[in-house]
């Protein structure tokens, strides 16, 4: 999932991340009241040759681990991602000023896999 | 998708790609009869800021960018996977060598998208 | 016709880096990866990384521990494998091959002889 | 890393002969091993890939045979131009070579 990383050395295994974001980091705290911030967190780590149960792994996700086994310079790794998301109830301004309370689907990673 | 890759140059963004799979070439010829292979296509490319509507990007994946682009050492970028996937109808021997039609969902990778 | 041509011989001192070319022709450089494969006197051949000639995409063997940096110039339709650090260990032929996918190694360079000695 | 082994190591034989190669993978590698022929001074020459695919302008005297761990690369009658080394090669998972079979005149 992190292209741009140049690593040599094994990463490990697909799993969750624990990560806070705050509403004021993002930028976002003259339009969203509450909360200040969510725990967001994130999917990382790799999706290798055997995928074992724990990784949540598709049939196509299992192929595809198999494919780039022999075929690394064309087909990549699957990749970790999130596997269930929960939404999170934001309190906010809209472009009226208007104060509205709306559910935000997809907004907190519960579990990871590959993908 | 490809973390195990040194790439200094700007990748294409998410999109699917097509990738036919014998199954001889997985080595699966001896216990599936049909079909011979399928179409089962992958996933591939940058999930960078800002994600336009064609990536399909779920809320947290627009928030993870964010936050990506102020921590790239902590946090990757959201990963290029499959939205849709379809499944295929394969004929096999079981353990028993019976003859057996069964279903196999999430085979084939119909959109992608950033997540 | 198809075919990978290589940059002449070379003789480095030990220490220095040696970056050698592989300009392919008569097909679309770009759908495939260039492979490096060495061959020291009397030794089996030896993988030494690839490029994805399109994406840019690479990736080293181990064995060479950050030694070996693989580049393509698209628009020159050359690929190169630079070494760095050398010892006398690495004096061999040095080749680039193409592959495509679900395939081996189906064309090859001439070949490149790096002697290094001090 | 997956290790390739041939044997033998030096091949003495005649024109005409018939001549075998045989090539061990340290894991099985399915059907995923090419043959390839090397003169001296010369790149190596792809013969055979999946095991027993003939590549195209390679002569029918050549053929490959073999799965999961045991290959064999087959020359029925041996002429002149065959006098070369040749090397097996996985090509399963990342690459490695045989450590290359020399076939001489006898």
């Known amino acids: 999932s992190a292209s741009d990383y140049n690593s040599s050395e094994l990463k490990t295994a697909c799993r969750k991340h624990e990560l806070y974001v705050s509403f004021q980091d993002l930028g976002w705290q003259d339009w969203i009241i509450a909360p200040k911030g969510y725990a967001a967190n994130y999917c990382d780590g790799e999706c290798s040759f055997p995928l074992n149960a724990h990784m949540n792994a598709t049939n196509h996700a299992i192929v595809q681990t198999l494919v780039h086994l022999m075929n690394p310079e064309y087909v990549p790794k699957p990749c970790c991602a999130p596997t269930k998301l929960n939404a999170i109830s934001v309190l906010y301004f809209d472009d009226n000023s208007n104060v509205i309370l709306k559910k935000y689907r997809n907004m907190v990673v519960r579990a990871c896999g590959c993908h | 998708s490809a973390s195990d890759y040194n790439s200094s140059e700007l990748k294409t963004a998410c999109r699917k790609h097509e990738l036919y799979v014998s199954f001889q070439d997985l080595g699966w010829q001896d216990w599936i009869i049909a079909p011979k292979g399928y179409a089962a296509n992958y996933c591939d490319g940058e999930c960078s800021f800002p994600l336009n509507a064609h990536m399909n990007a779920t809320n947290h994946a627009i928030v993870q960018t964010l936050v990506h682009l102020m921590n790239p050492e902590y946090v990757p970028k959201p990963c290029c996977a499959p939205t849709k996937l379809n499944a295929i109808s394969v004929l096999y021997f079981d353990d028993n060598s019976n003859v057996i039609l069964k279903k196999y969902r999430n085979m084939v990778v119909r959109a992608c998208g950033c997540h | 016709q198809v075919q990978l041509v290589q940059s002449g011989a070379e003789v480095k001192k030990p220490g220095a880096s040696v970056k050698v070319s592989c300009k392919a022709s008569?097909?679309?450089?770009?759908?495939?990866?260039i492979h490096w494969v060495r061959q020291a006197p009397g030794q089996r051949l030896e993988w030494m990384g690839w490029?994805?000639?399109?994406?840019?995409?690479?990736k080293q063997s181990q064995n060479f521990q950050d030694r070996v940096t693989i580049t393509r110039d698209t628009s020159a339709s050359a690929a190169y494998m630079e070494l760095s650090s050398l010892r006398s260990e690495d004096t061999a032929v040095y080749y680039c091959?193409?592959?495509?996918?679900?395939?081996?190694?189906?064309?090859w360079g001439q070949g490149t002889l790096v002697t290094v000695s001090s | 890393d997956i290790q390739m082994t041939q044997s033998p190591s030096t091949l003495s034989a005649s024109v005409g002969d018939r001549v075998t190669i045989t090539c061990r993978a340290s894991?099985?590698?399915?059907?995923?091993l090419a043959w390839y022929q090397q003169k001296p001074g010369k790149a190596p020459n792809l013969l055979i890939y999946?095991?027993?695919s003939l590549e195209s302008g390679v002569p029918s005297r050549f053929s490959g045979s073999g799965s999961g761990t045991e290959f064999t690369l087959t020359i029925n009658s041996l002429q002149p131009d065959d006098f070369a080394t040749y090397y097996c090669?996985?090509?399963?998972?990342?690459?490695?070579f045989g450590q290359g079979t020399k076939v001489e005149i006898k």
């Open positions: 091959a193409r592959r495509a996918i679900m395939a081996p190694f189906d064309l």
């Open positions: 008569g097909y679309t450089f770009t759908s495939h990866a």
């Open positions: 490029i994805h000639a399109g994406n840019g995409n690479s």
């Open positions: 894991q099985s590698i399915n059907n995923w």
């Open positions: 999946k095991a027993s």
């Open positions: 090669q996985q090509y399963y998972s990342s690459w490695t």
